[in-house]
């Protein structure tokens, strides 16, 4: 029986019964978030031989081995992967061994086995026999091999039953558990699979087979499965499906994607039955199951039944994802939102043509319209009262329309209207008139020169910083006192600052007017003494952190066309001083001889500067009697040693130690300091771990169905 499309077993271990009759899971298998430790011994699914996508195990309490659950799982095809992985075993608290002793092939993707505190028998499995490439495997944070004492069958009795292979220059026995060897086929079979009796399978078999050289006796197929036979390609009038089997036209014509609420149906393209036409192709008509190439970017026409589509949230914008032509009018009314500009670009960034009008009103969350990054034509087939096809009203934070140096937008019919956009300079509007070809269409009142740009520094002088002083969590800055033509019109200054690891921020960064990542603002009153330069103490800052700072003058002065003449500084980058680091992380100690301890730790999460050395303290403690009671010949886990905590100081310099020639009487060498490349690799590794964990959590924690 083919089960699917993807099976998610969570919360209740009894859901495992869903796997009872499955021989192939067409899709993924998730077993996760079972927090109550259960006895899984009564659950056994010997019929399951193939998973076409991936297997994910996460936080299943009480499960000690997968061998009893899936004794015959032979192939994980990896047709779709979980973050590049076909097998993920993550935070399985009680898992002692993987035990999938019949797993012979992972066709695509790597494995990730991480943070399984009790998991052993990892170094005894030769993954190169199962996967084509092992370089992308990620096996970290499991039980240390030294604490495992992994023994393959027969080793204790000195009658080893398993075969040996070499991994990392270590020639050793290969097994899954204390009583299950890793199966290897005779070298005469080459890349072919073999039976339990070491007879070579048919070349089209994958993993194993029940009879030699027979394409109907395969456990799984190397290429495709059709009508009980493994075939190298799908026969005529059948089509590849889900990467492993052949289906007929009738099957493909009647299936729908479960991931969509539409009923668009699958298509046949290039001999495959697939959910949608591939990139660069479009369906050949509404009733067609076939794809034809697009001329240029594939058009997607979207139509609003009520003629006007109101975009007032990310959710409403989502409906326009992938649309290139919008038949109707766009009314944009974004008052608030999180990360709104990039979300809107994601969903509306492909729109090239709007057949009606575009109206942007009360969109206080918008700083720019650049999220419509491909808009090139507004046809104006339908216009607002007064013959307007581009209407911009009361957008309190709108400062930029588009980057006109890189934008070609045409408004075919209709006029433009701008009013009550206090931060939008009129020069920006005039530039749009020129680019869009609407110059001369607007009447005098259509572009209001009084209330557009009234709160923007549209003609700015430059403020210069005069001094900067830093401490570990403070910055003091002063700047030249700005002297406008009429000194009474200088009201105050506003200082903007934010963390800036790189010197690449701009004034508009993070300004969707609601965003949590926008600039911090501090108002600075004028010093009463006209000769004193204005300044500010920024406090509560982080040590050893680069900040970007700029200052704006708040003025009343008007020039002849009713615009503020303002002043602002360039962006200044300044770093706070170093401070005491936070405590080192993950301190571990182990003994490698009768007179030595090796102590390891990770750097502090907040170094607050460039670390120069660590201080290590230790003290002698009485021997723990428990150590004498433990039988070290048993295969149970060895007790974890207590970590050292000490009193005697050692100063370990982390800067490059003096290089000395090793050997002779000199004694052991110091470990070479890490190169920049190694440090960078470690940093990337830590980042990658976080990204994967976030991906995992975001993928599996879903709202409870209604």
């Amino acid at each position: 029986e083919i089960c699917g499309p993807g099976i998610d077993i969570r919360n209740d271990y009894q859901q495992l019964k869903r796997l009872e009759n499955c021989t192939v899971i067409e899709g993924y298998l998730h077993i996760l978030l079972i927090s109550k430790a259960e006895d899984y011994r009564s659950y056994r699914f010997p019929k399951l031989t193939v998973i076409t996508e991936y297997l994910l195990l996460f936080r299943v309490a009480g499960l000690e081995s997968l061998g009893d659950l899936f004794p015959n799982l032979t192939v994980i095809r990896g047709w779709k992967l979980f973050y590049n992985y076909a097998l993920v075993i993550f935070e399985m608290t009680n898992l002692k061994d993987i035990g999938l002793y019949n797993l012979r092939n992972i066709t695509r993707g790597a494995i990730r086995i991480e943070k399984n505190a009790d998991l052993c028998y990892l170094s005894t499995v030769d993954w190169s026999l199962i996967l084509d490439a092992v370089s992308n495997n990620y096996i970290v944070g499991n039980k240390p091999p030294k604490e495992c004492g992994d023994l393959c069958p027969g080793t204790m009795e000195e009658k080893p039953m398993c075969e040996k292979t070499t991994i990392n220059n270590e020639y050793n026995y290969r097994c899954w558990t204390t009583n299950r060897c890793q199966k290897m086929c005779p070298s005469t079979c080459g890349k072919r699979a073999c039976t339990e009796n070491n007879e070579c399978c048919h070349p089209e078999c994958l993993g194993s087979c029940s009879a030699p050289d027979n394409d109907t006796a395969c456990v799984a197929c190397r290429h495709y499965y059709y009508a009980g036979v493994c075939v190298p390609a799908c026969p005529p009038n059948t089509y590849r499906f889900e990467g492993w089997r052949c289906v007929d036209r009738d099957f493909c014509a009647n299936i729908l994607s479960a991931e969509s609420s539409d009923s668009e149906g699958f298509v046949i393209h290039d001999g495959e039955c697939m959910q949608e036409c591939p990139s660069g192709f479009i369906r050949n008509g509404s009733q067609s199951m076939y794809c034809i190439p697009c001329e240029g970017p594939c058009p997607k026409v979207c139509e609003e039944e009520k003629k006007t589509k109101t975009i007032d949230s990310v959710t409403s914008a989502q409906m326009l994802q992938g649309c290139t032509i919008f038949k109707g009018n766009l009314l944009i009314n974004i008052r608030r939102g999180n990360n709104i500009a990039s979300e809107l670009e994601n969903f509306m960034g492909l729109i090239e043509v709007v057949t009606g009008y575009v109206k942007i009103r009360h969109s206080h969350a918008l700083v720019s319209l650049s999220f419509l990054k491909n808009l090139r034509l507004i046809l104006g087939e339908e216009q607002l009262e007064g013959n307007y096809s581009f209407y911009v009203l009361d957008n309190q934070n709108l400062q930029q329309l588009w980057d006109w140096d890189h934008r070609n937008l045409t408004i075919k019919a209709g006029k433009m209207y701008f009013a009550f956009n206090p931060k939008l300079c009129v020069s920006e509007i005039y530039r749009m008139e020129e680019v869009t070809g609407t110059k001369g269409r607007q009447s005098k009142g259509d572009i209001n020169t009084r209330n557009n740009g009234e709160r923007a520094s549209c003609e700015s002088d430059v403020l210069h910083f005069t001094s900067t002083t830093t401490s570990k969590n403070r910055i003091i800055i002063t700047w030249h006192r700005y002297r406008p033509p009429d000194y009474r019109d200088l009201i105050s200054f506003t200082v903007y600052y934010k963390e800036a690891p790189f010197k690449n921020v701009t004034e508009y960064d993070g300004q969707d007017a609601c965003g949590s990542n926008s600039w911090n603002m501090v108002d600075v009153d004028l010093p009463p003494n006209k000769d004193v330069e204005p300044g500010i103490l920024l406090h509560g800052l982080k040590p050893w952190t680069q900040y970007a700072v700029y200052v704006k003058a708040v003025t009343l002065t008007m020039v002849e066309n009713d615009h503020i003449r303002g002043a602002k500084s360039e962006i200044l980058y300044i770093r706070t001083n170093a401070s005491v680091p936070s405590i080192p992380l993950d301190v571990l100690s182990a003994s490698n001889s009768s007179s030595q301890l090796i102590v390891k730790w990770n750097p502090p999460s907040l170094p607050n500067g460039n670390l120069s050395y660590y201080i290590v303290r230790w003290q002698r403690q009485p021997q723990d009697g428990y150590l004498y009671r433990h039988n070290y010949c048993s295969k149970d886990k060895i007790p974890i040693r207590k970590y050292a905590d000490g009193t005697i100081d050692i100063e370990e310099v982390t800067e490059n130690p003096k290089t000395e020639v090793c050997g002779g009487e000199k004694g052991p060498c110091c470990a070479c300091p890490k190169t920049e490349a190694e440090k960078q690799a470690e940093k990337e590794e830590a980042e990658y771990r976080k990204v994967f964990e976030n991906f995992l959590h975001n993928s599996i924690f879903v709202p409870r169905p209604e």
């Epitope: 499309p5 998610d8 729908l256 991931e259 609420s261 009923s263 039944e305």
Partner: nanobody, 128 residues
Framework: EVQLVESGGGLVQPGGSLRLSCAAS????????MAWFRQAPGKEREGVSA????????YYADSVKGRFTISRDNSKNTLYLQMNSLRAEDTAVYYC?????????????????????WGQGTLVTVSS
């Protein structure tokens, strides 16, 4: 709240015609695939016909191909089923259903699990 109200059922002679309507409210009608199902007394519910939202692609059960036509009017939020050449075996309660997202993978258009909202049904009786 999504509501689906079927109408147009009734008694008709074999060979006759009927037009069923399904008025939908509480959803953005133009973005959802829709279908007609039917359930004859003592039998399982079966798919009759389905239609997509974006392109209007249609699907029919073999037993009704050439006799029934599904259509939709997005401006009126209404789904239709034109039934011609009716037979006694078409007697059933006809239900209107709206697609819903149902996790990963695929399903056949006539699988009830792919549909998240259902109407109360309208009875069609074909008898002489």
């Amino acid at each position: 709240e999504v509501q689906l109200v079927e109408s147009g059922g009734g008694l008709v002679q074999p060979g006759g015609s009927l037009r069923l309507s399904c008025a939908a409210s509480g959803l953005t009608f133009g973005t959802f695939g829709m279908a007609w199902f039917r359930q004859a007394p003592g039998k399982e519910r079966e798919g009759v016909s389905a239609i997509s939202a974006s392109s209007g692609r249609t699907y029919y059960a073999d037993s009704v191909k050439g006799r029934f036509t599904i259509s939709r009017d997005n401006s009126k939020n209404t789904l239709y089923l034109q039934m011609n050449s009716l037979r006694a075996e078409d007697t059933a309660v006809y239900y209107c259903a709206v697609r819903s997202k149902n996790g990963a993978g695929y399903g056949f258009w006539y699988e009830a699990r792919l549909y998240g909202y259902w109407g109360q049904g309208t009875l069609v009786t074909v008898s002489s």
